[in-house]
Amino acid sequence: QDPYVKEAENLKKYFNAGHSDVADNGTLFLGILKNWKEESDRKIMQSQIVSFYFKLFKNFKDDQSIQKSVETIKEDMNVKFFNSNKKKRDDFEKLTNYSVTDLNVQRKAIHELIQVMAELSPAAKTGKRKRSQMLFRGRRASQ
Amino acid sequence: QDPYVKEAENLKKYFNAGHSDVADNGTLFLGILKNWKEESDRKIMQSQIVSFYFKLFKNFKDDQSIQKSVETIKEDMNVKFFNSNKKKRDDFEKLTNYSVTDLNVQRKAIHELIQVMAELSPAAKTGKRKRSQMLFRGRRASQ
């Protein structure tokens, strides 16, 4: 059994989250995860879910009685979601910590917007699209 | 030229984000995106970046002078990042709107934690890992 299971049960007690009525009015995350099978779609959703848990854990970092549980779960998330890659985890944390109300951050975000947008489509990053367009044009020109 | 480019230039003026000094102290997003080539890693990062922009745009939704620009950019993000899939965009928005300080939300999140964790590894959802382990065991047993 993964170490997180026991610690998650401890958190359930702490948050009073074991009762059946907690499941009333549908799920938060599980229903959404069920909708997406494609790995890249799942990563889009899981990214938001993991950042939610990180925020929640951060808010309760001073509660001694769950500190060990929180640390164990975070470590296990690190293994499972970030593949134990510290750089990946650090970059992710950086992104989640930017303040959306800080004018300097806002300016930088707007400054980078065009380039960010250009990279959003899966094809964009490799230059595949450009290459195939050029091949297509070249073919037409030589006909 | 994509429609977002002109509108992003308009936002640059509005936020005074065209000056070279905006780029001081490194980038917010571009440097991080450069680190990740693998599509699923990029989606993890882009998910946070897109939610940052959505939050930023939401904060400025009452500023008439940039409303058209914001709407155009959001629509283009929808096309590029969510592949014009309304369900995907809606699920994403749902996740970004959960309040991390609401006890009922906290309870649900903790209630779902074990199942969420079980799905975090790429192999988890398809049962690939189990299948390959069984094949490996079978092979060893038949040698």
Epitope: Y14, N16, N59, F60, D63 | L103, Q106
Partner: nanobody, 126 residues
Amino acid sequence: QVQLQESGGGLVQAGDSLRLSCAASGRSFSSYGMGWFRQAPGKEHEFVAGIWRSGVSLYYADSVKGRFTISRDDAKMTVSLQMNSLKPEDTAVYYCAAEATFPTWNRGRFADYDYSGQGTQVTVSS
């Protein structure tokens, strides 16, 4: 030891607003979760709203969701309850209470809380 004193009650019309305040004295107010309860004549104490340390967890009774807002100021050692769109059924004595452990606080049972005040009367006429 924490002493709690509620204020801000009164007689108002349906649809009006009121802001209740609870002043704490004693040590380490910031380490307590706070809750507002109410008791209508002849009824049990009913949980209204709760706020955990530094506001990292909040919850409301379904009957007041969207109308009442709880907040705290640890520097001033106060917890407030902003009550909007009041209804006659909100009429009760309102008590503020303090609890030191999260699992007990989040169950929202008046008898389980460590400390409570004397209450302030809120009357909403139609």
